[in-house]
């Protein structure tokens, strides 16, 4: 059997970092065998069978010159094989990343936070960290490890299924190459890192009648699980065409009517989503999806961009409990839906 | 000869915008984690934000999340801190540093100095 | 975010006198902590990495101990050149932090 432990990488490569001392190891010979070690096409003779080295040859301080492939040849001048050198960096700890779309899944993706120049690869786990005792606030790694999938195609991701919402995982990211492994430890709460994908099917909609409505609605992102004790709530904004400002409100369910819309312009709306008891953090925004108040009786005089202008809008009436407001700053409730006078916001 | 060399200091008024760039040369940029620490006048050291050597994961701190952007461009050997919605408390010096791995600095930059004043 | 704390927070010693800065950190971090020098305008400069490795080039009277949570910084014969700030950092967690800082003068 050959004297040489053969490294993680492709068979007959031998690894070293520069500017350190590297020993390369002659594969077809018994340990000790004294060898002449020469480079690949060329004549002169390296280390000699003398050297009192054996099967190995040393070279000091070795630099990217003394990359390439090597022969070692036994004292009868039979060949013992031929090594190739590569030169690169022991693995740095990576850097990892973990996402929840939902509430019972995650994903972790990782970087290398050095390049080594060497063949590297991933090992991926996690274990279940659980609370000591009943008001402690130790926790310890109770239960696993067990290994996160990688995904198949070589992205450099992998999931954990069927996590439960209320445990802390500690992930194990270790990158691994032939010059050694290094390994990121990251603590993982879900409640923390939950980030729900954005709303789907965001349609708007003029209200006939009516030249200051427009009808947002939408769908739960495909990817949230349905089930009743999750549910997410919502951010929207709006805007007429050009203006730079949105408007923001926090919609009751899974539809919104504008009331102050600005009457013949065409309005930009976007939709986010967030779990509703505050965990994890806002989605992406929403594609923006675009409608246009329906025609109605405009007022006779628009003032300038930069006012706020109130009038009646032509419409049936229905008792109004409240005085209207504009929603041209971001507030947690629309104007009532009843408002029988509604506000033409013109915006800056 | 091995160094990083900040650009794009200067003074901007808060709510401002402004863009750092380092330029790094002598080593081989693209291996390597590269970050951004600053320092107000007569304080400490603040970590600012870090970028993987191949930019597909980047960090920062709280105090600027949202606000800023760390980028990298290999081919050009220089990184870059887009600095918006800026606050009288981001005047500081802006250092670039290069690693080795991720949050250890063994090359820095002369530093650019940002002021944030009206 | 992991505090890391320094003391003292300043020193004067005598020229050859032996110095030693120690940090704190608010948990535990293995051995992930570097010590740098900040001359007065100049950009900060490693000395010690991963709590007791000597950077490359850095002169030998300067040493580093510690792990978990407590950390000492040596400098065995303070030099005149040695007037500087010293900070400990972490880099246990991928949101370094750096201490306060400990002002070193001679006396």
């Known amino acids: 059997s050959s004297p040489c432990p053969q490294a993680w990488g492709p068979p007959g490569v031998q690894y070293g970092q520069p500017g350190r001392s590297v020993k390369l190891c002659c594969p077809g010979v018994t340990a000790g065998d004294p060898v002449s070690w020469f480079r690949d096409g060329e004549p002169k003779l390296l280390q000699g069978p003398d050297s009192g080295l054996g099967h190995e040859l040393v070279l000091a301080q070795a630099d990217s010159t003394d990359e390439g492939t090597y022969i070692c040849q036994t004292l009868d001048g039979a060949l013992g094989g031929t090594v190739t050198l590569q030169l690169g960096y022991p693995p740095a700890r990576p850097v990892v990343s973990c996402q929840a779309a939902d509430y019972e899944n995650f994903s972790c993706t990782w970087s290398p936070s050095q390049i080594s120049g060497l063949p590297t690869r991933y090992l991926t786990s996690y274990r279940k960290k659980t609370v000591l005792g009943a008001d402690s606030q130790r926790r310890s790694p109770s239960t696993g490890p067990w290994p996160c999938p990688q995904d198949p195609l070589g992205a450099a991701r992998c999931v954990v299924h069927g996590a439960e919402f209320w445990s802390q995982y500690r992930i194990n990211v270790t990158e691994v190459n032939p010059l050694g492994a290094s390994t990121r430890l990251l603590d993982v709460s879900l409640q923390s890192i939950l980030r729900p994908d954005p709303p789907q099917g965001l349609r708007v909609e003029s209200v006939p009648g009516y030249p200051r409505r427009l009808r947002a609605s939408w769908t739960y992102p495909a990817s949230w699980p349905c089930q009743p004790h999750f549910l997410l709530k919502f951010r929207l904004q709006y805007r007429p065409a050009q203006h730079p400002a949105w408007s923001t409100v926090e919609p009751a369910g899974l539809e919104e009517v504008i009331t102050d819309a600005v009457a013949g312009l065409p309005h930009a709306v976007r939709v986010s989503a967030r779990d509703f008891l505050d965990a994890g953090t806002w989605s992406t925004w929403s594609p923006e999806a675009w409608g246009t108040p329906s025609t109605g009786t405009i007022p006779k005089e628009i003032p300038a961009w930069g006012q706020l202008h109130t009038q009646p809008e032509v419409e049936p009436q229905v008792d109004s409990p409240a005085p209207p407001r504009p929603s041209l700053q971001p507030h947690p409730r629309l104007l009532d839906h009843r408002d029988s006078v509604e506000q033409v916001a013109v915006l800056a | 000869e091995v160094q990083l060399l900040e650009s794009g200091g200067g003074l901007v008024q808060p709510g401002g915008s402004l863009r750092l760039s380092c330029a790094a040369s002598?080593?081989?940029?693209?291996?390597?984690?590269m970050t951004w620490v600053r320092q107000a006048p007569g304080k400490g050291l603040e970590w600012v934000s870090s970028i993987v050597p191949y930019g597909d994961l980047t960090q920062y701190a709280e105090s600027v999340k949202g606000r800023f952007t760390i980028s990298r461009d290999n081919s050009k050997n220089t990184l870059y801190l887009q600095m918006n919605s800026l606050r009288a408390e981001d005047t500081a010096v802006y250092y670039c540093?290069?690693?080795?791995?991720?949050?250890?600095?063994?090359?820095w930059g002369r530093g650019t100095l940002v002021t944030v004043s009206s | 975010d992991i505090q890391m704390t320094q003391s003292p927070s300043s020193l004067s010693a005598s020229v050859g006198d032996r110095v030693t800065i120690t940090c704190q950190a608010s948990q535990d971090i293995n051995n992930y902590l570097n010590w740098y020098q900040q001359k007065p305008g100049k950009a900060p400069k490693l000395l010690i990495y991963d709590a007791s490795n000597l950077q490359t080039g850095v002169p030998s009277r300067f040493s580093g101990s510690g792990s978990g949570t407590d950390f000492t910084f040596t400098i065995s014969s303070l030099q005149p050149e040695d007037i500087a700030t010293y900070y400990c950092q972490q880099h246990e967690s991928q949101s370094p932090t750096f201490g306060p800082g400990t002002k070193v003068d001679i006396k």
């Open positions: 002598g080593f081989t940029f693209s291996w390597y984690s």
């Open positions: 540093a290069k690693g080795p791995g991720w949050g250890s600095f063994d090359l």
